[in-house]
């Protein structure tokens, strides 16, 4: 997928993109993270590159977004998966692709799924494939809550700033 | 898809739909554009019809949205593609479908992809197909930035106000 | 899809409108509904369970969301469908899957589609399938307007709080 990301030089300068606010005196926590394209078999979220950012209290800890203040947030994420045709000598097995945004909160002793998307892919001979998943919704979150993602099919991710991302903003 | 349009009588009353603002003394730039259904082999964005609008400084120039003031915006777009089965006499070739929201800014000498979704479709005999793509995310934008879209598969777009759209709003 | 938009004359006058304001600048109407998992062959929206909520004036009416005050809202919804392989003895017929958010306002004698996503699925032998659809956009809505959904393929819905939802928030 040529040209879906920034060139290295553009990426370097993109980091200095100003932290800008509309003319409101109140804080507006927001975050947009991108999947680290240098980590091919994992999904590591980054906020210090390209067009990613953390604003007004959002922070990143253990690959999770930490909710800066209690309130309602719109939370979203996208992944794009791709794959090649299977080799004629290999057996074609179905691929389960899934992406989930999860909440870890002191209220629950486990990760609660907030947003889930799923797909079964059946690779064929000579048939490269591509699949995109997006979801987002509004949730009541508490200061200190942790938002993370879980993905099935990580080796098939198309890791670029415009295809794999995760974010949230306070309403 | 029965009932997806307005009847003439409904269209007549639809004219009085208000330009409405929520109660903030500060401006809240927002825009929602729809693909012009009269242009079958291109994707032209319109804001002066149906439920589309430009509010508080957003404007449309060269098929791009112009960012009215620096700040963080949620940007989104959707396309729906459809196609018929290929003819038995024709060769079935894979179709690459893609939709991208791009940023053109004075900071970069090229269009930067912000949001990308992609799909490979393999039309089959007697098999009409439909595919939807949606994406949206928060970005730090600068006054005067241009938001545009690029689509592969334009002849296959299902152009209606509820299927093909592009918008943004300030956070 | 012929005729899915307004007539040109309607389009010309659709732009005008009075500004409206909330009575309390601090109020932020928001709603997030989830599909009731106990109702397997219908899609009933609930706000009194799991992570669903109605805030600052949103209300339910006949499985619709009632818009609490005039203004611009971001409206979104997701569904996930799944199915098993068809039996070798049965005929495989294509499945039309669709999900639509609709606006009902008495100015129209029918529901107006706001957001539509569609998919054709061709179940195969030994091939369970999964498909996700998401969409969202900003709309100018009027106090008392009713937002509802229409879904083709309800028996195939994967009803869980993270997969099937419908919401809106004021901008």
């Amino acid at each position: 997928l040529p040209g879906v990301g920034l060139t290295p030089s553009a990426a370097q300068t993109a980091r200095q993109h100003p932290k800008m606010h509309l003319a409101h005196s109140t804080l507006k926590p927001a975050a947009h993270l991108i999947g680290d394209p240098s980590k091919q078999n994992s999904l590591l979220w980054r906020a210090n590159t390209d067009r990613a950012f953390l604003q007004d209290g959002f922070s990143l800890s253990n690959n999770s977004l930490l909710v800066p203040t209690s309130g309602i947030y719109f939370v979203y994420s996208q992944v794009v998966f791709s794959g090649k045709a299977y080799s004629p000598k290999a057996t074609s097995s179905p691929l389960y692709l899934a992406h989930e945004v999860q909440l870890f909160s002191s209220q629950y002793p486990f990760h609660v799924p907030l947003l889930s998307s799923q797909k079964m892919v059946y690779p064929g001979l000579q048939e490269p494939w591509l699949h995109s998943m997006y979801h987002g919704a509004a949730f009541q979150l508490t200061q200190g809550d942790q938002l993370s993602t879980h993905t099935d099919g990580i080796p098939h991710l198309v890791l670029s700033p415009s295809t794999v991302f995760f974010g949230a903003f306070a309403l | 898809l029965p009932g997806v349009g307005l009847t003439p009588s409904a269209a007549q009353t639809a004219r009085q739909h208000p330009k409405m603002h929520l109660a903030h003394s500060t401006l809240k730039p927002a825009a929602h554009l729809i693909g012009d259904p009269s242009k079958q082999n291109s994707l032209l964005w319109r804001a002066n019809t149906d439920r589309a609008f430009l509010q508080d400084g957003f404007s449309l120039s060269n098929n791009s949205l112009l960012v009215p003031t620096s700040g963080i915006y949620f940007v989104y777009s959707q396309v729906v593609f459809s196609g018929k089965a290929y003819s038995p006499k024709a060769t079935s070739s894979p179709l690459y479908l893609a939709h991208e929201v791009q940023l053109f800014s004075s900071q970069y000498p090229f269009h930067v992809p912000l949001l990308s979704s992609q799909k490979m479709v393999y039309p089959g005999l007697q098999e009409p197909w439909l595919h939807s793509m949606y994406h949206g995310a928060a970005f730090q934008l600068t006054q005067g930035d241009q938001l545009s879209t690029h689509t592969d598969g334009i002849p296959h777009l299902v152009l209606s106000p509820s299927t093909v759209f592009f918008g943004a709003f300030a956070l | 899809l012929p005729g899915v938009g307004l007539t040109p004359s309607a389009a010309q006058t659709a732009r005008q409108h009075p500004k409206m304001h909330l009575a309390h600048s601090t109020l932020k109407p928001a709603a997030h509904l989830i599909g009731d998992p106990s109702k397997q062959n219908s899609l009933l929206w609930r706000a009194n369970t799991d992570r669903a909520f109605l805030q600052d004036g949103f209300s339910l009416s006949n499985n619709s969301l009632l818009v609490p005050t005039s203004g611009i809202y971001f409206v979104y919804s997701q569904v996930v469908f799944s199915g098993k392989a068809y039996s070798p003895k049965a005929t495989s017929s294509p499945l039309y899957l669709a999900h639509e958010v609709q606006l009902f306002s008495s100015q129209y004698p029918f529901h107006v589609p706001l957001l539509s996503s569609q998919k054709m699925v061709y179940p195969g032998l030994q091939e369970p399938w999964l498909h996700s659809m998401y969409h969202g956009a900003a709309f100018q809505l009027t106090q008392g307007d009713q937002l509802s959904t229409h879904t083709d393929g309800i028996p195939h819905l994967v009803l869980s709080p993270s997969t099937v939802f419908f919401g809106a928030f004021a901008l």
Partner: antibody, heavy 118, light 107 residues
Framework: EVQLVESGGGLVQPGGSLRLSCAAS????????IHWVRQAPGKGLEWVGY????????NYNEKFKGRATISSDKSKNTAYLQMNSLRAEDTAVYYC???????????WGQGTLVTVSS | DIQMTQSPSSLSASVGDRVTITCRAS??????VAWYQQKPGKAPKLLIY???HRYTGVPSRFSGSGSGTDFTLTISSLQPEDFATYYC?????????FGQGTKVEIK
């Protein structure tokens, strides 16, 4: 200052009809719906339905569907409640109300008494 | 329809007393409950919306709490002007319904 003034109440025969008016002032009439709420003597409150003067959108309590019609006249800044096939149990004070958010009855008229009796 | 049941139906109290009125919904209504005050011959007045938010101009002695099915209106220190009938209302789903009322009388 928001003001709502009801009129049109009085004595009605069983089986008869009534048309109540609600004159609104002090705000942009088309920006908010008008609700009708009734209260039988010594009893609680009962929501009848609403009309949005901007687009004539309506929503009714199923109990009153078919018997009640709520409408408005933008040129007169007035909302109306028409009720047919009246019976003794429709005897009540009828209020119009303007919300802030849709389901919050923030501003009320003084009420008008309708008595259904032969 | 969602039924709203208030208790008690009436109570006697003195100026300065702390008064609590409860309201139970027949099904969970999240936090979508409002409270109104009505004096004889007058229209109701909105006090509380969304279970716990005071409406503009309502004195701080009025507070609301609860979620799900059980809700409470509390008057922390009863004043002479507070003797009236109080109604709860669910605004979760239409038809919006009210409790039967609680009359607060002078002891």
């Amino acid at each position: 200052e928001v003001q709502l003034v009801e009129s049109g109440g009085g004595l009605v025969q069983p089986g008869g009809s009534l048309r109540l008016s609600c004159a609104a002032s002090g705000y942009t009439f088309t920006s908010y719906v008008i609700h009708w709420v009734r209260q039988a003597p010594g009893k609680g409150l009962e929501w009848v339905g609403y009309n949005n003067p901007y687009n004539d959108g309506t929503n009714y309590n199923e109990k009153f569907k078919g018997r009640a019609t709520i409408s408005s006249d933008k040129s007169k800044n007035t909302a109306y409640l028409q009720m047919n096939s009246l019976r003794a149990e429709d005897t009540a004070v009828y209020y119009c109300s303007r919300p802030t958010m849709l389901p919050w009855f923030a501003y009320w008229g003084q009420g008008t008494l309708v008595t259904v009796s032969s | 329809d969602i039924q709203m049941t208030q208790s008690p139906s009436s109570l006697s109290a003195s100026v300065g007393d702390r008064v609590t009125i409860t309201c139970r919904a027949s099904q969970a209504v999240s936090s979508a409950v409002a409270w109104y005050q009505q004096k004889p011959g007058k229209a109701p007045k909105l006090l509380i919306y969304s279970a716990s938010h005071r409406y503009t101009g309502v004195p701080s002695r009025f507070s609301g709490s609860g979620s799900g099915t059980d809700f409470t209106l509390t008057i922390s220190s009863l004043q002479p002007e507070d003797f009236a009938t109080y109604y709860c209302q669910q605004h979760y789903s239409t038809p919006w319904t009210f409790g039967q009322g609680t009359k607060v009388e002078i002891k």
